[in-house]
Interface confidence: medium
């Protein structure tokens, strides 16, 4: 576990878990329901999600200088998606297939966020936008868009942890 004061996380563990997250996010994507091409729209669901951006210190130089900025951003995103996957968007009708990896994905998001959470210190988490749909027909598209956005997020996180494991591990 990472500790306050800028200590490093268990980079190798984080790398392994983030790679698992990537695999799960891609395998969950087609299983959330058959996407209908009639369903479209702007990326509303991703407007408010945590993005890993240039100023977040997730580049190699930023990670070397102080990895905590980047890790906090990743942690925020993990908590954000963990909450979304536990919401009625995913738990409500239409039910997910019994073998859907969404449950595993949810647990892995929580697991990685716990690896990053410093002992005795709580990073500020981002508010979830009000996306709770009242009707089942709305959920299929939201699931699709959330998972598509999650795929992009965990891909970046996995690259960060791969770099950290290769160059920053003690």
């Amino acid at each position: 576990r990472a500790v306050p004061g800028g200590s490093s996380p268990a980079w190798t563990q984080c790398q392994q878990l983030s790679q698992k997250l990537c695999t799960l996010a891609w395998s969950a994507h087609p299983l959330v329901g058959h996407m209908d091409l009639r369903e479209e729209g702007d990326e509303e669901t991703t407007n408010d999600v945590p993005h890993i951006q240039c100023g977040d210190g997730c580049d190699p130089q930023g990670l070397r200088d102080n990895s905590q900025f980047c890790l906090q951003r990743i942690h925020q995103g993990l908590i954000f998606y963990e909450k979304l996957l536990g919401s009625d968007i995913f738990t409500g009708e239409p039910s997910l297939l019994p073998d859907s990896p969404v449950g595993q994905l949810h647990a892995s998001l929580l697991g990685l966020s716990q690896l990053l959470q410093p002992e005795g210190h709580h990073w500020e988490t981002q508010q979830i936008p009000s996306l709770s749909p009242s009707q089942p027909w709305q959920r299929l598209l939201l699931r699709f868009k959330i998972l598509r956005s999650l795929q992009a997020f965990v891909a970046v996180a996995a690259r960060v942890f791969a770099h950290g494991a290769a160059t920053l591990s003690p």
Epitope: S134, P136, L141
Partner: antibody, heavy 117, light 107 residues
Framework: EVQLLESGGGLVQPGGSLRLSCAAS????????MHWVRQAPGKGLEWVSS????????WYADSVKGRFTISRDNSKNTLYLQMNSLRAEDTAVYYC??????????WGQGTLVTVSS | DIQMTQSPSSLSASVGDRVTITCRAS??????LNWYQQKPGKAPKLLIH???NLQSGVPSRFSGSGSGTDFTLTVSSLQPEDFAIYYC?????????FGQGTKVEVK
């Protein structure tokens, strides 16, 4: 009292365009998803399109996909349906409806669109 | 797409009669079914939502039942104002589809 009032219908030639409006009152419009539904003369009901409360997500029936565009202006409490490349089979009464706790809980009175040469 | 099939297409009844209309979905829609009443020249009016929940302001003589693929709308004692066309509709998945309608006429 919830009220939905459609306007903008009329006679248009095949291939022409029309924009329908649905003025909403009596509720916080920006909190609700909305639908357009149509009914050809003497026929049943057909769902046309739906839109997310902020307008960022839209859904369409196959029969109108690529020709119709649903949109909304939450500052004006108004829902729109832009209809292009109109065909005779688009002739119908067009209704807007609200997605409340019960879907399609309130409907407007409808506006008639006639596509004919 | 989920097809909704109503039966009968029309029926003749008298005031005071008990009337039952059925609706069948082509696949499981759980309980996500609405019933509407439409009178000539008027917009449809929501009667029942989620298969069995009476919409506010709708008389208690209307009731709905069913889940999965088979659903029923019952009018326990038909009143003069109940002669109309009734539609079922699934709100489970896009495209949202309606039954073809059942016309309730005066016998």
């Amino acid at each position: 009292e919830v009220q939905l009032l459609e306007s903008g219908g009329g006679l248009v030639q095949p291939g022409g365009s029309l924009r329908l409006s649905c003025a909403a009152s009596g509720f916080t419009f920006s909190n609700y998803a909305m639908h357009w539904v149509r009914q050809a003369p003497g026929k049943g009901l057909e769902w046309v399109s739906s839109i997310w409360p902020s307008g960022g997500i839209t859904w369409y029936a196959d029969s109108v996909k690529g020709r119709f565009t649903i949109s909304r202006d939450n500052s004006k409490n108004t829902l729109y349906l832009q209809m292009n490349s109109l065909r005779a089979e688009d002739t119908a009464v067009y209704y807007c409806a609200r997605v409340g706790a019960a879907d399609f809980d309130y409907w407007g009175q409808g506006t008639l669109v006639t596509v004919s040469s | 797409d989920i097809q909704m099939t109503q039966s009968p297409s029309s029926l003749s009844a008298s005031v005071g009669d008990r009337v039952t209309i059925t609706c069948r979905a082509s696949q499981n829609i759980n309980s996500f079914l609405n019933w509407y009443q439409q009178k000539p020249g008027k917009a449809p009016k929501l009667l029942i939502h989620v298969a069995s929940n009476l919409q506010s302001g709708v008389p208690s003589r209307f009731s709905g039942s069913g889940s999965g693929t088979d659903f029923t709308l019952t009018v326990s004692s038909l009143q003069p104002e109940d002669f109309a066309i009734y539609y079922c509709q699934q709100t489970y998945s896009i495209p949202l589809t309606f039954g073809q309608g059942t016309k309730v006429e005066v016998k």
